[in-house]
């Protein structure tokens, strides 16, 4: 889980090892602040929980790509 050390900076100290279906993910944000120990991706799930993930992992990159495309596609 992400940890807000000094709001508004949120950092990730551990990443999930578990691969998660993109269909459980609603959105994401990148953590690139120099105040944080490592770059990270925070996924928000369909039930509004937040998960720290490693942006170097393929499933994380694929999930971000999928969510990007989902955002770009207008709903009919």
């Amino acid at each position: 889980q992400p940890d807000a050390i000094n709001a508004p900076v949120t950092c990730c100290y551990n990443f999930t090892n578990r691969k998660i279906s993109v269909q459980r993910l609603a959105s994401y944000r990148r953590i690139t602040s120099s105040k944080c120990p490592k770059e990270a991706v925070i996924f928000k799930t369909i039930v509004a929980k937040e998960i720290c993930a490693d942006p170097k992992q393929k499933w994380v990159q694929d999930s971000m790509d999928h969510l990007d495309k989902q955002t770009q596609t207008p709903k009919t």
């Epitope: 999930t16 691969k19 459980r24 998960i51």
Partner: antibody, heavy 119, light 113 residues
Framework: QVQLVQSGAEVKKPGASVKVSCKVS????????MHWVRQAPGKGLEWMGG????????IYAQKFQGRVSMTEDTSTDTAYMELSSLRSEDTAVYFC????????????WGQGTLVTVSS | DIVMTQSPDSLAVSLGERATINCKSS????????????LVWYQQRPGQPPKLLIY???TRESGVPDRFSGSGSGTDFTLTISSLQAEDVAVYYC?????????FGQGTKVEIK
């Protein structure tokens, strides 16, 4: 392809504990979210608990809280489910179950382990 | 917790005839942002673990014959076997996977008339 192989049948006395194992191959256990589902004779499927990556921890069905423990040995890629204070109603087949990308349903199942609780 | 209720509890159908199983959830399992229903169907033959048939309410798992189909949205779902075969004798379960705890229907036993 994930494969799950469970330990053999057990007979236990009321009040005892049982520990069922589930050996993973084809994946490492830490990539998967392992869950446990049981089925009493002639009855339906009942989710007991498992690792939920959305919570970052193992979660348990309220019914089993305090009586069940689900653990992992990452060195052997083996998951364990231990149920204590056994009673006759715990007689059931216990399944481990998972999928490659956690979504909340199960496309890989162990073969099942029959636990019989009898005095 | 979301309660899943299946109907009927059992049904007997002639070979080659249609079998229909219903599943109702106590609250919606539709996520409107992706328009997906978080519902699956399993088949369980005697002495075997459950086998995934259908996920996202209507997507057939690979290798599942096309006589099996899933439909419905929100709270009401249906599994249809269009032409019952002898190997389809089993218990069928629905399960919601929107919210934990993950919950199953009580099962529907399908037999040959």
């Amino acid at each position: 392809q994930v494969q799950l192989v469970q330990s053999g049948a057990e007979v236990k006395k009321p009040g005892a504990s049982v520990k069922v194992s589930c050996k993973v191959s084809g994946y490492t256990l830490t990539e998967l979210s392992m869950h446990w589902v049981r089925q009493a004779p002639g009855k339906g499927l009942e989710w007991m608990g498992g690792f939920d990556p959305e919570d970052g921890e193992t979660i348990y069905a309220q019914k089993f809280q305090g009586r069940v423990s689900m653990t992992e040995d990452t060195s052997t890629d083996t998951a364990y489910m231990e149920l204590s204070s056994l009673r006759s109603e715990d007689t059931a087949v216990y399944f481990c179950a998972t999928n490659e990308f956690w979504s909340g349903y199960f496309d890989y199942w162990g073969q099942g382990t029959l636990v019989t609780v009898s005095s | 917790d979301i309660v899943m209720t299946q109907s009927p509890d059992s049904l007997a159908v002639s070979l080659g005839e249609r079998a229909t199983i219903n599943c109702k959830s106590s609250q919606s399992v539709l996520y409107s942002s992706n328009n997906k229903n978080y519902l699956v169907w399993y088949q369980q033959r005697p002495g075997q673990p459950p086998k995934l048939l259908i996920y996202w309410a209507s997507t057939r798992e690979s290798g599942v014959p096309d006589r099996f189909s899933g439909s419905g949205s929100g709270t009401d779902f249906t599994l249809t076997i269009s032409s019952l075969q002898a190997e389809d004798v089993a218990v069928y379960y629905c399960q919601q996977y929107f919210y934990s705890p993950w919950t199953f229907g009580q099962g529907t036993k399908v037999e040959i008339k």
